[in-house]
């Protein structure tokens, strides 16, 4: 297993609709053809694999399971979007990148993006 640098923004504010997007960029030492990206949430004394995707370079990301994430890839960048977030989902979201093929296997883990989610205030009653 070889180490690899992964960069991601320090802070992101989710939209009022509970959507947060950020870029995860990795310094690929070679020409990887199969890449796996995992988003981890570290908060509340827990580590959770929020979503994971494997993709072949140049192809769409295929997320595993019932994913709340979507994403696209461009070169060594992955644009990740997490949906359905609420205030309680605020936390540190860490990007983990694995170069699966061809060998050697590379692993990189970012420092994390602190995602802040603010639940929208309910609209006041109106006579109109």
């Amino acid at each position: 297993c070889k180490a690899m640098h992964v960069a991601q923004p320090a802070v992101v504010l989710a939209s009022s609709r509970g959507i947060a997007s950020f870029v995860c960029e990795y310094a690929s030492p070679g020409k990887a053809t199969e890449v796996r990206v995992t988003v981890l949430r570290q908060a509340d004394s827990q580590v959770t694999e929020v979503c994971a995707a494997t993709y072949m370079m140049g192809n769409e990301l295929t997320f595993l399971d019932d994913s709340i994430c979507t994403g696209t890839s461009s070169g060594n960048q992955v644009n990740l979007t997490i949906q359905g977030l609420r205030a309680m989902d605020t936390g540190l979201y860490i990007c983990k990148v694995e170069l699966m093929y061809p060998p050697p296997y590379y692993l990189g883990i970012g420092n994390g993006t602190q995602i802040y989610v603010i639940d929208p205030e309910p609209c006041p009653d109106s006579d109109f």
């Epitope: 959770t48 929020v50 979503c51 994971a52 595993l64 399971d65 019932d66 709340i68 989902d89």
Partner: nanobody
Framework: EVQLMESGGGLVQTGGSLRLSCVAS????????MGWFRQAPGKDREFVAA????????SYADSVKGRFTISRDNAKKMAYLQMLFLKLEDSAVYYC??????????????????WGQGTQVTVSS
């Protein structure tokens, strides 16, 4: 709901290992996120680990991360908790639970509506 029954608990020395099993009956097992919780005497029930419906995504409490591994076999309607390097503070009754919901960011708070009877794990020095 599904019916759940745990097994595999017992007495083990510090640093030892155990593998807990949880068998499900009733509804379609693969529709449920599965979790393991534990409760020590005089303490609240606490989240240990959870696994998504297909088994591809997992969540762990910091206190067990790197020592415990959750897994599942949908064909056998089984969930497992492999516990290594056990510590005195791991002693508790361990429960498996099922939540009829998809994965998300906080599986410890999912609406687990089915619970097993629990299996006792005792770690001694």
């Amino acid at each position: 709901e599904v019916q759940l029954m745990e097994s595999g608990g017992g007495l083990v020395q510090t640093g030892g290992s155990l593998r807990l099993s949880c068998v499900a009956s009733g509804r379609t097992f693969s529709n449920y996120t599965m979790g393991w919780f534990r409760q020590a005497p005089g303490k609240d029930r606490e989240f240990v680990a959870a696994i998504s419906r297909s088994g591809s995504l997992k969540s762990y409490a910091d206190s067990v991360k790197g020592r415990f591994t959750i897994s599942r076999d949908n064909a056998k309607k089984m969930a497992y908790l492999q516990m290594l390097f056990l510590k005195l503070e791991d002693s508790a009754v361990y429960y498996c639970a099922a939540a009829p919901v998809p994965w998300g960011t906080r599986p410890s708070t999912f609406p687990y509506d089915s619970w097993g009877q629990g299996t006792q794990v005792t770690v001694s020095s």
